[in-house]
Interface confidence: low
């Protein structure tokens, strides 16, 4: 059975999930996706790896561990009652059904106290690639639910937003942990 | 073994020109960031421009837009730094250096050996 | 531009010392922080990225951390090799900008 996370509304989640690069660097694709792990891949993918870098990720859902040493731990901003469920963390391990699958429970609670308003956030800051004008300040913000989705494979026309992400708090804990090598 | 070599420095007359070069190895440009940075001499670091190779996507400090060209031939795993118009101000060693497109993570891990740009009547 | 303030511009330590360097972002640029060693004539070199994880290859000694928009590199025993010049860098936003450098010098 699934393990289970719970955060609050309005809070951040934090779903635990390492692996161990066979060499420093070595790294292995990995997905992020919402529903349990399919046979192959993640369904309704939110975020990915590849060898060497982030290549896709969803406005809420950042890597906030140092991935580059294995810890791959989903970070989600901000939550709502709409994402809970279960989450797939699939460690893209070379071979045929050589994958891990780790199954993740995401149980979300209401808030004691109402929240207050997604957080607006300095858009020229957050993404300064997307406005090259400089001195933007305040009035032009934009929230995080509007922030587009990101695929490395359409870089050439979403080069601005790729190059930037806020992380939530620096959050660690203990959970799914594998051995590559 | 990841390596970046820069090439292409050397003395122009203020108003001139020069291309840099920055050839990599062990490594393929495409999917990284490459920056350029510079040094003034006894100065500290100042960041120039960057290109992503597989967009061609750059970005330019305020310093040298609009005379400074960023590109890349991913064919070759190689930059360039086109400088036109060149300023006394501009005299530096010239650095490439390697980043990457997660921001949050965009320091550089390897640097190349620099090369002298020196601008001078 | 967000800048970035190091501090001290230069120190004088001994062989064994415990050697602390500042840099002060003027906003808040997260944990996207890296420090950098140079040496006369030689490129920088990455000690610390992301505030405080250790670059490979970079000893134990070096350390850094993060409280708020203030950032630390700790040298906790300095080395002969370890004498050069520490710059700071964010990385959270374009410009990238890099401190101005602390020369680490011998007593």
């Known amino acids: 059975s699934e393990v289970e996370y719970r955060a609050e509304v309005g809070q951040n989640a934090y779903l635990p999930c390492f692996y161990t690069p066979a060499a420093p660097g070595n790294l292995v694709p990995v997905c992020w996706g919402k529903g349990a792990c399919p046979v192959f891949e993640c369904g309704n993918v939110v975020l990915r790896t590849d060898e060497r870098d982030v290549n896709y990720w969803t406005s809420r859902y950042w890597l906030n561990g140092d991935f580059r040493k294995g810890d791959v731990s989903l970070t989600i901003e901000n939550v709502t009652l709409a994402d809970s469920g279960i989450y797939c963390c699939r460690i893209q391990i070379p071979g045929i059904m050589n994958d891990e699958k780790f199954n993740l429970k995401l149980v979300i609670k209401p808030a004691k106290v109402t929240p207050a308003p997604t957080r607006q956030r300095d858009f020229t800051a957050a993404f300064p690639r997307m406005l090259t004008t400089r001195g933007h300040g305040p009035a032009e913000t934009q929230t995080l639910g509007s922030l587009p989705d990101i695929n490395l494979t359409q870089i050439s026309t979403l080069a601005n937003e790729l190059r930037d992400s806020r992380l939530a708090n620096d959050l660690r804990d203990s959970g799914a942990t594998i051995r590559i090598g | 073994e990841v390596q970046l070599v820069e090439s292409g420095g050397g003395l122009v007359q203020p108003g001139g020109s020069l291309r840099l070069s920055c050839a990599a190895s062990?490594?393929?440009?495409?999917?990284?960031?490459i920056h350029w940075v510079r040094q003034a001499p006894g100065k500290g670091l100042e960041w120039v421009a960057d290109?992503?190779?597989?967009?061609?996507?750059?970005e330019y400090a305020d310093s040298v837009k609009g005379r400074f060209t960023i590109s890349a031939d991913t064919s070759k795993n190689t930059a360039y730094l086109q400088m036109n118009s060149l300023r006394a101000e501009d005299t530096a060693v010239y650095y490439c250096a390697r980043g990457y497109v997660y921001r949050m993570w965009d320091s550089f891990d390897y640097w190349g050996q620099g090369t002298l740009v020196t601008v001078s009547s | 531009d967000i800048q970035m303030t190091q501090s001290p511009s230069s120190l004088s330590a001994s062989v064994g010392d415990r050697v602390t360097i500042t840099c002060r972002a003027s906003?808040?640029?997260?944990?996207?922080v890296a420090w950098y060693q140079q040496k006369p004539g030689k490129a920088p070199k990455l000690l610390i990225y992301s505030a405080s994880f250790l670059y490979s290859g970079v000893p134990s000694r070096f350390s850094g951390s993060r409280s708020g928009t203030d950032f630390t590199l700790t040298i906790s025993s300095l080395q002969p090799e370890d004498f050069a010049t520490y710059y700071c860098q964010q990385h959270y936003t374009t410009p990238p900008t890099f401190g101005q450098g602390t020369k680490v010098e011998i007593k």
């Open positions: 906003q808040d640029v997260n944990t996207a």
């Open positions: 290109i992503i190779p597989t967009a061609g996507y750059t």
């Open positions: 062990g490594f393929n440009i495409s999917g990284y960031v």
